[in-house]
């Protein structure tokens, strides 16, 4: 069964800046990755970035840089300032759409006791 993993890390240099990394463990052709916060994209979450392997990347504030790390993993850096900046207990979710298996998603957040720079 395919699985999705999510890591959330607060940057040591910018304490309100986050890096989210997500990966897909499974076969099939990854068609789209959707990163959201505040819950899954289909359950009230707000989309931060959409990554398509052929048609490119779309991102919305406070997302600063979304990119493919490998064919089956992505990373997203969030800006650390402004009214829409994330807080330490924000939930981030990644949804991988793989053809023809379907969609698989997982969520993660920064552990309450995490020091800056440690991965969740």
């Amino acid at each position: 069964t395919p699985e999705v993993w999510v890591q959330v890390r607060m940057e040591a240099t910018e304490l309100s800046s986050f890096t989210i990394r997500c990966g897909f463990l499974g076969s099939g052709s990854i068609s789209l990755v959707t990163v959201s916060w505040g819950g899954p994209n289909g359950a009230g979450g707000t989309t931060l970035a959409v990554l398509h392997p052929e048609r490119g990347i779309r991102q919305w504030a406070p997302a600063r840089q979304a990119r493919w790390e490998t064919q089956s993993s992505i990373s997203l850096i969030l800006e650390g300032s402004g009214a829409s900046s994330p807080c330490a207990n924000t939930t981030f979710c990644c949804k991988f759409a793989s053809f023809p298996e379907g969609s698989w998603e997982a969520c993660g957040s920064l552990p309450p006791s995490s020091d800056p720079g440690l991965s969740a």
Partner: antibody
């Protein structure tokens, strides 16, 4: 304008074979996942085969597995469905359809369909 | 397999009135739900994708809502050209599955 045109349907005896074709135009065929969906007379819709845009991943339900084979020729902008060991219950209109990644794999374009009748 | 169950099987609504079609999934399908309209002798046409997004050219009297396992297609003011069979569809998990269809007629 996106166009999908099916051909190859007809009357065939039980145990016989048919090859359906779908000619695509108006879009970059190689960038899309494609499917065959059938509809028996007066009945609902059933996905009978799907193929990923790279051609590496395919799907068949148990009802047709081992009998139907989906393939694509991106140079010819064509989708195919080879149907062997046909049964009376395979009688249906067969539609070629295109999946849109950005729409959660919804099928945003359909052909007019080709009728396959399996009868002795 | 995820089973999509539509209700009602058929529906008769007066012109200008609201029509509501429900679709229940046997398990959560996130937001990967679409609705199609099929008129006699024609292929299905995409109306709604991602639960509530109208496809290009679809009149705004059509709307979709819901989450998780329960979804609804609403036609706010029925027009004569809306007479058709409507299907819900989930593309969350293979195999993609459709509802059995709801036949919409004018009362």
């Amino acid at each position: 304008e996106v166009q999908l045109v099916e051909s190859g349907g007809g009357l065939v005896k039980p145990g016989g074979s048919l090859r359906l074709s779908c000619a695509a135009s108006g879009f970059t065929f190689s960038s899309y996942h494609m499917s065959w969906v059938r509809q028996a007379p007066g009945k609902g819709l059933e996905l009978v085969s799907a193929i990923s845009r790279d051609g590496d991943s395919t799907y068949y339900p148990d009802t047709v597995k081992g009998r139907f084979t989906i393939s694509r020729d991106d140079a010819e902008n064509s989708l195919y469905l080879q149907m062997n060991s046909l049964r009376a219950e395979d009688t249906a209109v067969y539609y070629c359809s295109r999946h849109e990644d950005y729409f959660g794999f919804a099928m945003d374009s359909w052909g007019q369909g080709t009728l396959v009748t399996v009868s002795s | 397999d995820i089973v999509m169950t539509q209700s009602p099987d058929s529906l008769a609504v007066s012109l200008g009135e609201r029509a509501t079609i429900n679709c229940k999934a046997s398990q959560s399908v996130s937001n990967d739900v679409a609705w199609y309209q099929q008129k006699p002798g024609q292929p299905p046409k995409l109306l709604i994708y991602y639960v509530s997004h109208r496809f290009t050219g679809v009149p705004d009297r059509f709307s979709g809502s819901g989450s998780g396992t329960d979804f609804t297609l609403t036609i706010s003011s029925l027009q004569a050209e809306d007479v058709a069979v409507y299907f819900c569809h989930q593309a969350y998990r293979s195999p993609w599955t459709f509802g059995q269809g709801t036949k919409l007629e004018i009362k």
